[in-house]
Amino acid sequence: ALDTNYCFRNLEENCCVRPLYIDFRQDLGWKWVHEPKGYYANFCSGPCPYLRSADTTHSTVLGLYNTLNPEASASPCCVPQDLEPLTILYYVGRTPKVEQLSNMVVKSCKCS
Amino acid sequence: ALDTNYCFRNLEENCCVRPLYIDFRQDLGWKWVHEPKGYYANFCSGPCPYLRSADTTHSTVLGLYNTLNPEASASPCCVPQDLEPLTILYYVGRTPKVEQLSNMVVKSCKCS
């Protein structure tokens, strides 16, 4: 699986999850998020050669098409597969609010 | 929606579904598919600016991050959203077989 366990431990050029730390205030301008100050959102990148963690029959077909037609612009793209939520703390006036934001952290990638 | 109805009728630079005809024999080397000879598989391409058909909270965050940090290599990617099956005819010996291959035709795209 192209997950953090594998990708963070290997120098993988092809599609894999990569570490990306996002600071809410600095990187997004979100001053309203009180905690955490930032988090590892991660992202997916790297080429998708034929059959690499293909998401659908279409991505398999497109991967093969791209292999046999390397000049073609059509190829699968490395995108998030498994995502996890992030719990944040913010304030409404002086009242603290805790909320779970879904699909905030990429744990694994696929070729789609 | 970034679907064929919209994308095929507009000159859209950003993420959209693009027409791609694949000839089974010529493009994939699949001589075993008797009918059809080829089909419109289509593909997704184009930049994913902030908020464009964002698939998850992560893609929204990543889009905003990329807008505010344009030098960053992390950005959402334009990939298939809705796919449709394709019915094919092939032979096992002299016996014709009809099979529906799932997720073969891209009908719309998203930024993931």
Epitope: Y21, D23, R25, Q26, K31, H34, E35, P36, K37, G38, Y39, Y40, T87, L89, P96, V98 | -
Partner: antibody, heavy 117, light 107 residues
């Protein structure tokens, strides 16, 4: 590499004020919160407050409001903590520490403050 | 304010032993917790962040675990350089209070 260099030891009289500095290098000073921590001799750690040098935003421990004032100078990448109306209870080692990824990952060497007449 | 209750306050152990220090938060801190080691006269050093992640350069004999309100730091096969004081600290809303500390001494 990240470094936080604090000003030297201070000996001050009760009732006076003192300003401790923390010069940062090796990272983007403006865009990381700076925390300040107090440690009395032989005691544990107490969080005083934090400042975001980019816009001067601050958060204080209620216990230190009116006692500590945090400021930052972006041009010199230096954070400051002013302590006022000093008493013997303020005698302690004070640390600055960079906030990163849900922790304080780099700490200054500490500044010893002695309040005595 | 969130209170952090750390135990034990002190611990006398031999080299090679395994120790576990615990920290209890007065409310859920959603794994926003760090562990530090401090030697006499020195600044604290980050060991673990986000409850379970080992900081750069920290030996693998250290490990953090826990969630919700209960957290622990485990040190396997204690080395002589591991003796000193240990503190937990939460990062779930200011003030970021510390635990009272655990003094680890050589038996």
């Amino acid at each position: 590499q990240v470094q936080l260099q604090q000003s030297g030891a201070e000996l001050v009289k009760p009732g006076a004020s003192v300003k401790i500095s923390c010069k940062a290098s090796g990272y983007a000073f403006s865009s990381s919160w700076m925390n300040w921590v107090k440690q009395r001799p032989g005691k544990g750690l107490e969080w005083i407050g934090q400042i975001y040098p980019g816009d001067g935003d601050t958060n204080y421990n209620g216990k230190f409001k009116g006692k500590a004032t945090l400021t930052a100078d972006k041009s010199s990448s230096t954070a400051y903590m002013q302590l006022s109306s000093l008493t013997s209870e303020d005698s302690a080692v004070y640390f600055c520490a960079r906030h990163y990824d849900g922790s304080t990952d780099y700490w200054g060497q500490g500044t010893t403050l002695t309040v005595s007449s | 304010d969130i209170q952090m209750t750390q135990s034990p306050a002190s611990l006398s152990v031999s080299v090679g032993e395994t120790v576990t220090i615990t920290c209890r938060a007065s409310e859920n801190i959603y794994s926003n917790l760090a562990w530090y080691q401090q030697k006499q006269g020195k600044s604290p050093q980050l060991l673990v962040y986000a409850a379970t992640n080992l900081a750069d350069g920290v030996p693998s004999r250290f490990s953090g675990s826990g969630s919700g309100t209960q957290y622990s730091l485990k040190i396997n096969s204690l080395q002589s350089e591991d003796f000193g004081s240990y503190y937990c600290q939460h990062f779930w809303g200011t003030p970021y209070t510390f635990g009272g500390g655990t003094k680890l001494e050589i038996k």
